[in-house]
C-alpha cells in the first residue's frame, strides 16, 4: 500500500541532491585549496541532518548550526558583494573580481545554489515530489531557513563598504520583501560598516534615466541611514561595458562613464 | 574599525594547559559575539567555539568540548580561551574573531600554540 504523503505547492527536491551536493563539495575544496581540509561527507551529513526525519515547516536556524560549523571560511569583510534579483551579473562580476566574494562564492553558498531540498517528519526519506513553497504553504522550511540563516551571517561578517548590485529593470528595483530587504539590510552592523553603496544596472541600451532617483531606491538610503550606515548610490548604464571594463580597466573607453 | 590583538601562545608538553587572551577595540566589545578559530600548519581555518556578546551563551566544536572554555570580560574588552589536556593536533595559529561564523576575517596577528614534547 503506498504510504500517503504531505502535498506541498513547491517543486520537490532537486534529483540527486545528495550526489549535487558533495560533488559540489569536492569540487570547489579542489579550486579553493584553503578549503582542502573539508571532508565533504561530514558537510553532506551535517547538511542532510538539518532536514531529515523534521517536519519541513517546523526547521529553525539552530538545525543547521553543524553545517554552519564545518563551513568556517574566511571572508575579506570589505570585499562583499550583495546583489538583489540580478545574481547572473553579480556572479559573473565576482569571476572577473575574483577578490570580492558574493554569498554563492563561499562554501556553504556554493553548495545551495539553485537547488530545492525537504524531507518528511519520523522518516528519514527526501522528498523529491514536493516541497513547501514560502508564500503558499511556511517560511520556515528547509530552503528558506537554509537562506536566511547563511545571508544573515554574511551580512553579520561585513565591514567598511558594502556593495550591493540591484536589479534597475524592475518595478521594485529595492524590494523590501527580497533576503537583500528583508535580512541583509538589517543584519550589517553600524559599528563595522561604514558605507552600503548601491549598483543600479540597466536593463535598456537607451535607458538614461538616473535611476538612483527611483523612489525604492530613497526607501533604501532611508532605513540605510537610520541604522547610521552611509549611503551611496551609482547607475549602471551599459552592464555589458562595465565587465567588459572589470576585465580590462585600462582599455581606453573605460574611462567615461558606463 | 575592530582591532584585536591575540596573546598567551607558546610551547606546551601534551597534557598541558594555556590560557589565550584577545584584546579586542574599535567596537562596542558586547554587543558583539566573538569567537576562536584556528589554523594548523598547511590546514585551513577551523572554528573552535564562541561566546554570545552577554557571556550567556557558548558553543564549541566537537573537538575541544569539555577540554576548552570560552569566556569574555566585558569590562576590559576582553575574550579569553582556557586550554586544557592540551593535544599534538590542537598546534595551531589562534585568531580572535568578531561574529559568530561561519565566515571570519580575522584582523590579529593570531597566538601560535605548539602541543609537543
Known amino acids: 500500500v503506498p504510504r500517503w504523503r504531505q502535498q506541498w505547492s513547491g517543486p520537490g527536491t532537486t534529483k540527486r541532491f545528495p550526489e549535487t551536493v558533495l560533488a559540489r563539495c569536492v569540487k570547489y575544496t579542489e579550486i579553493h585549496p584553503e578549503m582542502r581540509h573539508v571532508d565533504c561527507q561530514s558537510v553532506w551529513d551535517a547538511f542532510k541532518g538539518a532536514f531529515i526525519s523534521k517536519h519541513p515547516c517546523n526547521i529553525t536556524e539552530e538545525d543547521y548550526q553543524p553545517l554552519m560549523k564545518l563551513g568556517t571560511q574566511t571572508v575579506p569583510c570589505n570585499k562583499i558583494l550583495l546583489w538583489s534579483r540580478i545574481k547572473d551579473l553579480a556572479h559573473q562580476f565576482t569571476q572577473v573580481q575574483r577578490d570580492m566574494f558574493t554569498l554563492e562564492d563561499t562554501l556553504l553558498g556554493y553548495l545551495a545554489d539553485d537547488l530545492t531540498w525537504c524531507g518528511e517528519f519520523n522518516t528519514s526519506k527526501i522528498n523529491y515530489q514536493s516541497c513547501p513553497d514560502w508564500r503558499k504553504d511556511c517560511s520556515n522550511n528547509p530552503v528558506s531557513v537554509f537562506w536566511k540563516t547563511v545571508s544573515r551571517r554574511f551580512a553579520e561578517a561585513a565591514c567598511d563598504v558594502v556593495h550591493v548590485m540591484l536589479n534597475g529593470s524592475r518595478s521594485k528595483i529595492f524590494d523590501k520583501n527580497s533576503t537583500f530587504g528583508s535580512v541583509e539590510v538589517h543584519n550589517l552592523q553600524p559599528e563595522k560598516v561604514q558605507t552600503l553603496e548601491a549598483w543600479v544596472i540597466h536593463g535598456g541600451r537607451e535607458d538614461s534615466r538616473d535611476l538612483c532617483q527611483d523612489p525604492t531606491i530613497k526607501e533604501l538610503e532611508s532605513i540605510i541611514s537610520k541604522r547610521n550606515i552611509q549611503f551611496s548610490c551609482k547607475n549602471i548604464y551599459r552592464p555589458d561595458k562595465f565587465l567588459q571594463c572589470v576585465k580590462n580597466p585600462e582599455d581606453s573607453s573605460c574611462t567615461s562613464e558606463i | 574599525e575592530v582591532q584585536v590583538l591575540e596573546s598567551g601562545g607558546g610551547l606546551v608538553q601534551p597534557g598541558g594547559s594555556l590560557r589565550l587572551s584577545c584584546a579586542a577595540a574599535g567596537f562596542t566589545f558586547s554587543n558583539f559575539a566573538m569567537s576562536w578559530v584556528r589554523q594548523a600548519p598547511g590546514k585551513g581555518l577551523e572554528w573552535v567555539s564562541t561566546?554570545?556578546?552577554?557571556?550567556?551563551?557558548?558553543d564549541y566544536a566537537d573537538s575541544v568540548e569539555g577540554r576548552f572554555t570560552i569566556s569574555r570580560d566585558n569590562s576590559k574588552n576582553t575574550l579569553y580561551l582556557q586550554m586544557n589536556s592540551l593535544r599534538a593536533e590542537d598546534t595551531a595559529v589562534y585568531y580572535c574573531?568578531?561574529?559568530?561564523?561561519?565566515?571570519?576575517?580575522?584582523r590579529g596577528q593570531g597566538t601560535l600554540v605548539t602541543v609537543s614534547s
Open positions: 561566546i554570545s556578546g552577554g557571556g550567556g551563551g557558548t
Open positions: 574573531a568578531d561574529g559568530r561564523g561561519p565566515f571570519f576575517d580575522y
